[in-house]
Interface confidence: low
Amino acid sequence: AQEVQQSPHCTTVPVGASVNITCSTSGGLRGIYLRQLGPQPQDIIYYEDGVVPTTDRRFRGRIDFSGSQDNLTITMHRLQLSDTGTYTCQAITEVNVYGSGTLVLVTEEQSQGWHRCSDAPPRASALPAPPTGSALPDPQTASALPDPPAASALP
């Protein structure tokens, strides 16, 4: 069965720094989403080989990509306190397969010592049910994403 290997499990970084999240699979994908989990999960990026990546307005200009959709490294730059959260890779095959998640803790520089990542990965039970639609806009669209609906026709 298809699996998504995601790293790191957790990282603590100061405001303004960057973080790399790597999503690796055995191939056979249509594309890959990076989703920020929470009460209202958000699609951050959609990446597909040979296509201009689509990025949520909140992260536009702050995300770089390297590799391919089968082994993708997503670099998030100029992190803000509000970027703290768990990010999970969602590989699109015939079924939606999730990575284990990356907990990103963005801290004020002087308070880094108060926040530590444990060795345990984020709990898989925190992952949402696979969505049947995505709210990502076209790459050139400047509007912010609405909350992802249960199902939608993409633009």
């Epitope: 249509r30 594309g31 989403y33 959609y46 597909e48 080989d49 040979g50 296509v51 689509t54 699109i92 939606n96 049947t132 639609g133 995505s134 990502l136 076209d138 026709a153 993409l154 633009p155």
Partner: nanobody, 117 residues
């Protein structure tokens, strides 16, 4: 208005070949991921093959690997499915579909393929 119109189905013998076409209007096939699905009587719709939006990768169901080939002609705005070495279990209604991201947004009505033994 988006329309996907399949053609090329028919009745063939085991081991024969067919080429299905899917003519698109209202969308540009080179800007969409395009795929083929099939549904046999009394069964759920089944993925057959797709070609990525960028055109650089294709996916096939295990049951058709090595026998079916998906392709598209951007100038004709048409998707194709070349089906070789057909088997009775390939009998189904074949539909093409288009997706902008991961979810399939647009569907054709389908064309019947019947493989007799």
């Amino acid at each position: 208005q988006v329309q996907l119109q399949e053609s090329g189905g028919g009745l063939v013998q085991t081991g024969d070949s067919l080429r299905l076409s899917c003519a698109a209007s209202g969308l540009t096939v080179s800007s969409y991921g395009m795929g083929w699905f099939r549904q046999a009587p009394g069964k759920e719709r089944e993925f057959v093959a797709d070609i990525s939006r960028g055109g650089g990768s294709t996916l096939y169901a295990d049951s058709v690997k090595g026998r079916f080939t998906i392709s598209r002609d951007n100038l004709k705005n048409t998707l194709y499915l070349q089906m070789n070495s057909l088997k009775p279990e390939d009998t189904a209604v074949y539909s093409c579909a288009a997706r902008k991201y991961a979810e399939w947004n647009y569907w054709g009505q389908g064309t019947q393929v019947t493989v007799s033994s």
